[in-house]
């Protein structure tokens, strides 16, 4: 066959769907690779063709669109499963072509099994809620296009295994789950099960997401430098190792970049000739506040090094702060000569 623009296997779109549930998968060509949509392509006389490669096979084969009850069908640029089966797992290809043009892309589809508590190998999206912030909502994701607006589905929400009906700070409101006051105890996996009728059959859509309760912007503060501080003096003799920790607390801020760095005499350590190493460690609180520690280390400090200015800097979306470490050379203890006079006297 003639040449075809092959975009290869689009592993960025690792699609996971639950077994025995409807799935609608849009051809990625129009979403990510081509500059025109399906309607334009269709009106220009281009045809969309689907085929697949089963799991652990190399053979490309056409998709069987003649299964009972139209279990697999195509509608415009969407491939429909009503419902999926476990052995639908494989790499699917959509190809757009006419006599003079051809473009195709493949993508992996994994049909996943879940247990009665909705546990599965599915990668879960994470939704962050601010702690004690007022009413916040999560919305049942990826259910658009499965049923017309005239159909009123029933939606049941679960936290882990348990139906949400006896929670005093969480209210199920259809496609939304409203958190009146988000608490650490609300951390966990939340599942919405959407049930809708279609052509005399009942279908279920299961969507699970992880809720993580994080620090509230109401409580956010600029970075706080705990160390160095005015109470600790780093007093060293030449030749000793100098270790100065810079420990900074950052409030959780959505999409904020937290930075910590040292300057020595106003310059970054990389820009000066002394043999300095910086080691960083990061820890997080339950609400994702962050503590960063950068330890500045000079193995064998010189008297010149002990005269330098060592400043710890920190920056977040809330502001920038700096604190100098108190470094000084240890004054050697004076050496006293003790003369012992021994007298031998007769008694």
């Amino acid at each position: 066959s003639e040449r075809c623009d092959d975009w290869g296997l689009d592993t960025m779109r690792q699609i996971q769907v639950f077994e025995d549930e409807p799935a609608r998968i849009k051809c990625p060509l129009f979403e990510h690779f081509l500059k025109f949509n399906y309607s334009t392509a269709h009106s220009a006389g281009l045809t969309l063709i689907w085929y697949w490669t089963r799991q652990d096979r190399d053979l490309e084969e056409p998709i069987n669109f003649r299964l009972p009850e139209n279990r697999i069908s195509k509608e415009k640029d969407v491939l429909w499963f009503r419902p999926t089966l476990l052995n639908d797992t494989g790499n699917y290809t959509c190809m757009l072509r006419n006599t003079t043009y051809c473009s195709k892309v493949a993508f992996p589809l994994e049909v996943v099994q879940k247990d009665s508590c909705f546990n599965s190998p599915m990668k879960l999206p994470v939704h962050k809620l601010y702690i004690e912030y007022g009413i916040q909502r999560i919305t049942c994701p990826n259910v658009d296009g499965y049923f017309p607006s005239s159909v009123k589905p029933t939606i049941t929400w679960y936290m882990g295994c348990y139906k949400i009906q006896n929670f005093n700070n969480v209210i199920p409101e259809g496609m939304n789950l409203s958190f009146l006051i988000a608490l650490i105890s609300n951390n966990g996996n939340y599942t919405c099960v959407v049930t809708y009728p279609e052509n005399g059959r009942t279908f279920h859509l299961t969507r699970t997401l992880t809720v993580k309760v994080v620090g509230s912007p109401k409580n956010a503060v600029p970075p706080v430098i705990h160390s160095p501080n005015d109470h600790v003096v780093y007093e060293k003799e030449p030749g000793e190792e100098l270790l100065i920790p810079c420990t900074v607390y950052f409030s959780f801020l959505m999409d904020s970049r937290n930075e910590v760095w040292w300057t020595i005499d106003g310059k970054k350590p990389d820009d000066i000739t002394i043999d300095v190493t910086i080691n960083e460690s990061i820890s997080h609180s339950r609400t994702e506040d962050e503590t960063r520690t950068q330890i500045l280390s000079i193995k064998k400090v010189t008297s010149e090094d002990l005269k330098r200015s060592y400043v710890c800097h920190a920056r977040s979306a809330k502001g920038e702060v700096a604190k100098a470490a108190k470094v000084k050379q240890k004054v050697p203890a004076p050496r006293y000569t003790v003369e012992l006079a021994c007298g031998f006297g007769a008694t």
């Epitope: 004690e132 929670f167 005093n168 259809g174 009146l180 608490l183």
Partner: antibody
Framework: QEQLEESGGDLVKPEGSLTLTCTAS?????????ICWVRQAPGKGLELIAC???????TWYASWAKGRFTISKTSSTTVTLQMTSLTVADTATYFC????????????WGQGTLVTVSS | ALVMTQTPSPVSAAVGGTVTINCQAS??????LAWFQQKPGQPPKLLIY???TLASGVPSRFSGSGSGTEFTLTISGVQSDDAATYYC???????????????FGGGTELVVK
């Protein structure tokens, strides 16, 4: 046995103030509960006034109650309702109830305390 | 704001009969509705929450149904002890204002003959 008891109901003059207290026994307000105040005028229906989430102190007020009524957690077993600028229309039995803002199986009511506003 | 409308009031039923009390919400409250029973001189008692879940210790002759804006409390095999006033209580949040609305219905008196 878990119980709620209201106290502080009294005869008060119009424009006067009064503080009602809801005391828990058999459980503590350190846990995550809504404690709410509800009132019922003689021969009338129930009216929710205000609620407080005991573990965090978050409050909710009925729109008509904002400004004149203040709900507070004063200890691990007491919640108060401060009422100011009282009118004859505030004459009612005042109940405190647990988990009423969002009703759960942990819902629990006190016996109520009577507030009479009269000159 | 949320308004809960109860009908009919009063309602009467014979011992052993079936009675239904309706509650209508002014907006969609999904299944966030509770039913209470109150007898004279007593505080209300929870019967049903989540529109249809029976509270513990409540006889199975009480049942709740409905979702959205229309709700029903049904008492099958009415007993003389069921003579009381019944209240519905709805709750919802407002997406545009992030307010929470909570309202009792006006109450329905059940007279048992």
């Amino acid at each position: 046995q878990e119980q709620l008891e209201e106290s502080g109901g009294d005869l008060v003059k119009p424009e006067g103030s009064l503080t009602l207290t809801c005391t828990a026994s058999g459980f503590s307000f350190s846990s995550n509960y809504w404690i709410c105040w509800v009132r019922q005028a003689p021969g009338k229906g129930l009216e929710l006034i205000a609620c407080i989430y005991t573990s965090t102190g978050n409050t909710w007020y009925a729109s008509w109650a904002k400004g004149r009524f203040t709900i507070s957690k004063t200890s691990s077993t007491t919640v108060t309702l401060q009422m100011t600028s009282l009118t004859v229309a505030d004459t009612a039995t005042y109940f405190c109830a647990r988990d009423l803002l969002v009703v759960t199986s942990f819902n629990l009511w006190g016996q109520g305390t009577l507030v009479t506003v009269s000159s | 704001a949320l308004v809960m409308t109860q009908t009919p009031s009063p309602v009467s039923a014979a011992v052993g009969g079936t009675v239904t009390i309706n509650c209508q919400a002014s907006e969609d409250i999904y299944s966030n509705l509770a039913w209470f029973q109150q007898k004279p001189g007593q505080p209300p008692k929870l019967l049903i929450y989540g529109a249809s879940t029976l509270a513990s210790g409540v006889p199975s002759r009480f049942s709740g149904s409905g979702s959205g804006t229309e709700f029903t409390l049904t008492i099958s095999g009415v007993q003389s002890d069921d003579a009381a006033t019944y209240y519905c209580l709805g709750v919802c949040t407002d997406i545009s204002t992030d307010d929470l609305y909570n309202a009792f219905g006006g109450g329905t008196e059940l007279v048992v003959k």
